[in-house]
């Protein structure tokens, strides 16, 4: 484990104030837990439980992030963990609000230079491969809060200080106001709100809905771009097939995106990325002769 990380500061479960939400019954079932004369009950949710070593992982990621991003050295990682924990511990996991995450959002405040925001929808890996090469562009997961939570699941229980490692609410089957969904909605909204200049979005051209109104991009980010700060949204439609030469910028869902964006007084541009492998290679080595032709 992180023995050396925790030598000086143990993770404390019982510190800080905890705001209790009213208990609204979800569709989860109750299962007994603990051994003793008085059985305690744990809500059984449809989704997978909290990622193992969740507290250690969040703290370790924070430490790593501040090490490699010296401009974030002012961040106290123990305080970040306390704020993260405070957002969901002892709260009913179907009644989490964006307000619960505000202390964490405040601690993780970060700005992206204008023209350097990269949004993505259903194509996370390529977006991250791109920003790993194009170091001056940033996805949400390149920011502290996105980095902390990427690929993790977490939830607590009403009126206990415990983390639920057995199950957490599923967005569809249980409730949408769960700790993970509300976190991503909160930080995605903030990420979009603070974007400026030309904003880029990477979209998956292999999906039936290249632009999906129900994705985080379609339901949160698109509607929180600020027209007074954002001049344009440029979509990069990533093709999946080797021989796919169609102009996916003419796809009906892209036209729908264009309509939404234009109505918000933001200009819209679209580009086909026919060869994502070549695209990445050319970002790495722009002087390569094969990069002078289209990608």
């Amino acid at each position: 484990g992180l023995n050396d990380i925790f030598e000086a500061q143990k993770i404390e479960w019982h510190e800080g104030s905890h705001h209790h939400h009213h208990h609204h019954h979800g569709s989860g079932s109750l299962v007994p837990r603990g051994s003793g004369s008085l059985p305690r009950w744990r809500q059984q949710w449809s989704g997978s439980g909290t990622t193992s070593r969740f507290p250690e992982t969040v703290l370790a990621r924070c430490v790593k992030y501040t090490e490699v991003h010296p401009e974030m050295r002012h961040v106290d990682c123990q305080s970040v963990w306390d704020a993260f924990k405070g957002a969901f511990i002892s709260k009913y996991p179907c009644n989490i609000t964006e307000e619960d995450y505000q202390p964490l959002v405040k601690l993780g405040t970060q700005t992206v230079p204008c023209n350097k925001t990269l949004l993505w929808s259903r194509i996370k890996d390529l977006a991250h491969q791109f920003t790993q090469v194009q170091r001056d562009m940033f996805t949400l997961e390149d920011m502290l809060l996105g980095y902390l939570a990427d690929d993790l699941t977490w939830c607590g229980e009403f009126n206990t200080f415990e983390i639920n490692y057995q199950s957490c609410p599923d967005w569809r089957k249980d409730c949408s106001n769960n700790p993970v969904s509300v976190f991503w909605k909160t930080v995605s909204r903030r990420f979009a709100e603070t974007a400026c200049g030309v904003v880029h979005v990477m979209l998956n051209g292999s999906r039936s809905k290249i632009f999906d109104k129900n994705s985080t991009f379609g339901s949160v980010e698109v509607h929180n771009l600020q027209p007074e700060k954002v001049q344009a949204l440029e979509a990069w439609v990533i093709h999946g097939g080797r021989e796919d030469s169609r102009d996916l910028c003419q796809d009906p869902t892209i036209k729908e995106l264009e309509s939404i964006i234009s109505k918000r007084n933001i200009r819209f541009f679209c580009k086909n990325i026919y060869r994502p492998d070549k695209f990445l290679q050319c970002v790495k080595n722009p002087e390569d002769s094969s990069c002078l032709s289209g990608i």
Epitope: G1, D4, I5, F6, A60, V63, K64, P70, C77, Q132
Partner: antibody, heavy 120, light 107 residues
Framework: EVQLQQSGPEVGRPGSSVKISCKAS????????MNWVKQSPGQGLEWIGW????????DVAEKFKKKATLTADSSSSTAYIYLSGLTSEDTATYFC?????????????WGQGSLVTVSS | DIVMTQSPTSISISVGERVTMNCKAS??????VDWYQQKTGQSPKLLIY???NRYTGVPDRFTGSGSGTDFTFTISNMQAEDLAVYYC?????????FGGGTKLELK
């Protein structure tokens, strides 16, 4: 106890490549960034770059961008540095090193070093 | 890149004496400077982090001070086992950069 165990000495011909390993133990490998540092014979120390083993993300100093490739294998808790196009300038001892929480951003943990000799 | 200029390059000293060495950064690095000791054939050893904090187990005869661009490292009571090369390193900005080193030799 945190330990960083590096591979043994390597001899490479000019133009060839070598790969040095750094096996970590005593902590969860993905919880820390691994750094690499070069020390030429009788010379000072130069920071090469870092790798985040959890994601494979790297940052390499401009001077070493065409020379060094950093990788990591989480399953074996091992970080690697691959040095290509070897020249006499690459003859040096290479160290892996990492920070410790609550000890600033210095390197309290170091591997024992791996000597690379480039010779025809 | 930030240049760390260390001085002097070498010092001749007797056991029991006080020794001071300096490190000057080419731009402000706040207090993000660490000091290392390296003995022949060994890996560097962290002595001081964030300009003035002694690392765990480091004897109190080793002290560091400074902030911004000027940093000082002092051994108050030189011991024979302290013969080594001492390096400063800035960790404020990537790439991290080291000073050229100060070699301690016996008079």
């Amino acid at each position: 106890e945190v330990q960083l165990q590096q591979s043994g000495p390597e001899v490479g011909r000019p133009g060839s490549s070598v790969k040095i390993s750094c096996k970590a133990s005593g902590y969860t490998f993905t919880d820390s960034v691994m750094n690499w540092v070069k020390q030429s014979p009788g010379q000072g120390l130069e920071w090469i770059g870092w790798i985040d083993p959890e994601y494979g993300r790297t940052d390499v100093a401009e001077k070493f961008k065409k020379k060094a490739t950093l990788t990591a294998d989480s399953s074996s808790s091992t970080a690697y540095i691959y040095l290509s196009g070897l020249t006499s300038e690459d003859t040096a001892t290479y160290f892996c090193a990492r920070t410790k929480y609550n000890s600033g951003y210095g390197f309290p943990y170091w591997g024992q070093g791996s000597l690379v000799t480039v010779s025809s | 890149d930030i240049v760390m200029t260390q001085s002097p390059t070498s010092i001749s000293i007797s056991v029991g004496e006080r020794v001071t060495m300096n490190c000057k950064a080419s731009q402000n690095v706040d207090s993000d400077v660490d000091w290392y000791q390296q003995k022949t054939g060994q890996s560097p050893k962290l002595l001081i982090y964030k300009a003035s904090n002694r690392y765990t187990g480091v004897p109190d005869r080793f002290t560091g001070s400074g902030s911004g661009t000027d940093f000082t490292f002092t051994i108050s009571n030189m011991q024979a086992e302290d013969l080594a090369v001492y390096y400063c390193m800035q960790s404020n900005t990537h790439p991290r950069t080291f000073g050229g080193g100060t070699k301690l030799e016996l008079k």
